[in-house]
Each structure stands twice: as structure tokens, then as C-alpha cells.
């Protein structure tokens, strides 16, 4: 069964800066990745970035840099000031559309006890939705 993992990290140098990393553990080819915050995409969440493996990347504030890390994982740097700034309990979600598995989405947030610059190793987050 495919899985999605999400890792959220606060940068030590800038406390309003977050790095979100997401990955897809499956054998299919990824056709699209959507990163949102405040909840799952399409369920109250706000899209931060959309990444297509070949067409390109679209991102919106406070996203600063979205990129592919590997063929099955992405990272997104957020920096905010004021209303658009993420906070420690913000939920970030990643939705991977793949063929033939369908869409798989998972969410994560900063571990409650984590120090700036530290985070738990990326582990598969609970799968919220699988749209086949």
C-alpha cells in the first residue's frame, strides 16, 4: 500500500521560517503534488504550492521555494511575517497524485517538543485520504 510521509521543521536561524518535506512511498509515477496548510487540500486548506514533475512548479506566499528533492519527494520553504506567517501548530498537508495508485494525502505539523532546527526523522504520517 502506498504511503505519504510529511516532515515539518522550524529553522533555527529564522523562527518564522519552516521547511516542509513530503515523500511518496509507492511504485507508481507521480503526476502532481499539492502542498497546503490549514487542512487537506479541498477541505479548508489553502494551497501553498503545486508541483508537476515536468511542467513546472507554482507557489504562493508565504511559500518561498518549492522544489523536487528526488523523483518521489519534495520540499517547500516557507517564510512569513504578519498575517501570512505560519505558526508552530500549523498543519501542513501533501497530496500526491500518482498512476496507477490514485491520490494519497497526509498531514503533519511541527512536533510539540521540537527545538528550532530539529525535527523528528521523516516517518509515514497517517494517510488521511486515498482517492482511487
Amino acid at each position: 500500500t502506498p504511503e505519504v510521509w510529511v516532515q515539518v521543521r522550524m529553522e533555527a536561524t529564522e523562527l518564522s521560517s519552516f521547511t516542509i518535506r513530503c515523500g511518496f512511498l509507492g511504485s507508481g509515477s507521480i503526476s502532481l503534488v499539492t502542498v497546503s496548510w490549514g487542512g487537506p487540500n479541498g477541505a479548508g486548506g489553502t494551497t501553498l504550492a503545486v508541483l508537476h514533475p515536468e511542467r513546472g512548479i507554482r507557489q504562493w506566499a508565504p511559500a518561498r521555494q518549492a522544489r523536487w528533492e528526488t523523483q518521489s519527494s519534495i520540499s517547500l520553504i516557507l517564510e512569513g511575517s504578519g498575517a501570512s506567517s505560519p505558526c508552530a501548530n500549523t498543519t501542513f498537508c501533501c497530496k500526491f497524485a500518482s498512476f496507477p495508485e490514485g491520490s494519497w494525502e497526509a498531514c503533519g505539523s511541527l512536533p510539540p517538543s521540537s527545538d528550532p532546527g530539529l525535527s523528528a526523522p521523516p516517518t509515514p504520517a497517517p494517510i488521511l485520504r486515498a482517492d482511487l
Partner: antibody
């Protein structure tokens, strides 16, 4: 298949504003950004910016910041581009596009002339 | 901003012959993470909007004839029409799809010799 239908040609005076609409059908309007591109007569293509209809998040080309505003109405699947303080150099065909420029509107000619 | 420079500005090719258009970017369009080049090619005929031909430097958009092909990596890219047809007369643009703002080449006008 996504279809984008734009509003008709406009003739405007220098200093005024123009609002161009782009109505989408055949796809999920809120999922992908609507891009705006212009093309002056006999010239190349210039990206103005984009809006993500679902959240009204925007990105603007620095060249147009402060003069252009993007809005979107999810209820009618329509995106709008308003360009203010028009000058003769803004005479161009304005296009909306979606899904990484795979789909395009037919274009709207905006003529700025006194 | 990434500057896209096409060559030649105009090109005349006989029907059935090969047409080649080059595009050079001022920065690499290669995403090292997934080894994909974020470059697109468009065809524009008079009075029409641009039509996407190629994305990811070499992937043909659905419905595009296989006589169109794209190649290249990093900063140097090529659009090739293997056997020119009359309906291929148009202006062709390359585009940076790697980073904001998306920027286009100045265009190459393709005519029949």
C-alpha cells in the same frame, strides 16, 4: 477539456483602467492558477502574473506590480485582470491561460489611445 | 529574471525538410532533484493564441504530431520539426518554466522556402 473564454475588445483612454474577464469551463477552476500573458502588436509574449482561484493567492511580474490586480469568482468560474493607469504601450492582446500554459483563452485586444 | 534567447530569429525551410530552432537560457532550467528540465515550446499562428507543443524539454503535449520533438538540458535546448508541413508555418517560442517569472524567448518565425 478546459475552455477559457475571454471578454471582448476594449478601447481605452490613457490614464484609465481596463478589466478583462476569463471564464473557465470543463475543469476544476480552483485547482490550478490562471495565468495572464500579454502580447503587444508584432511582439513576443510577456507574463503579467497569476491567481490561484481557490485561495485568491497571486504572483505578479514586478514590472506590473501596483498597476495590475487579479481577482476570481469561484461561483462563476471567472478570473479577472484589471490594469490601471493605462498608457499607449499597454496596447496589446491580453491572454488568460491555465494548467502551465496548456490551455489559452482566445485573447482580448486592449487599445489605449487618446 | 531568466533570459531566454532563441536562434535564429527567422528560418525558411522547404516542405518535407527538417527545421531546427535553438533556445538558450541565462540560467540552468534543470531541477537537480528529479533531473527534469523545465522548458516549454509553443507554436503561434497569426490571430491565434499560443499552443503548447512540448513541456519538460522533450515531452509532447497531447495531440501534438510526432514530427515535433524537443531536446536539450541545462541551458541549451532545441525544437526540431522532422518533416516540415505547410501548417507548421508559425512563430515558435521557448519558455522558462523553472522559476518566477516565467519568461519567453523572443520568438522564431518559421516560413516555407
Amino acid at each position: 477539456e478546459v475552455q477559457l473564454v475571454q471578454s471582448g475588445a476594449e478601447v481605452k483612454k490613457p490614464g484609465s483602467s481596463v478589466k478583462v474577464s476569463c471564464k473557465a469551463s470543463g475543469g476544476t477552476f480552483s485547482s490550478f492558477s490562471i495565468e495572464w500573458v500579454r502580447q503587444a502588436p508584432g511582439q513576443g509574449l510577456e507574463w503579467i502574473g497569476e491567481i490561484l482561484p481557490g485561495s485568491n493567492s497571486t504572483n505578479y511580474n514586478e514590472k506590473f506590480k501596483g498597476r495590475v490586480t487579479f481577482t476570481a469568482d469561484e461561483s462563476t468560474s471567472t478570473a479577472y485582470m484589471e490594469l490601471s493607469s493605462l498608457r499607449s504601450e499597454d496596447t496589446a492582446v491580453y491572454y488568460c491561460s491555465s494548467y502551465w500554459f496548456a490551455y489559452w483563452g482566445q485573447g482580448t485586444l486592449v487599445t489605449v489611445s487618446s | 529574471d531568466i533570459v531566454m534567447t532563441q536562434s535564429p530569429d527567422s528560418l525558411a525551410v522547404s516542405l518535407g525538410e527538417r527545421a531546427t530552432i535553438n533556445c538558450k537560457s541565462s540560467q540552468s532550467l534543470l531541477n537537480s532533484g528529479n533531473q527534469k528540465n523545465y522548458l516549454a515550446w509553443y507554436q503561434q499562428k497569426p490571430g491565434q493564441p499560443p499552443k503548447l507543443l512540448i513541456y519538460g524539454a522533450s515531452t509532447r503535449e497531447s495531440g501534438v504530431p510526432d514530427r515535433f520533438s524537443g531536446s536539450g538540458s541545462g541551458t541549451d535546448f532545441t525544437l526540431t520539426i522532422s518533416s516540415l508541413q505547410a501548417e507548421d508555418v508559425a512563430v515558435y517560442y521557448c519558455q522558462n518554466a523553472h522559476s518566477y517569472p516565467p519568461t519567453f524567448g523572443q520568438g522564431t518565425k518559421l516560413e516555407i522556402k
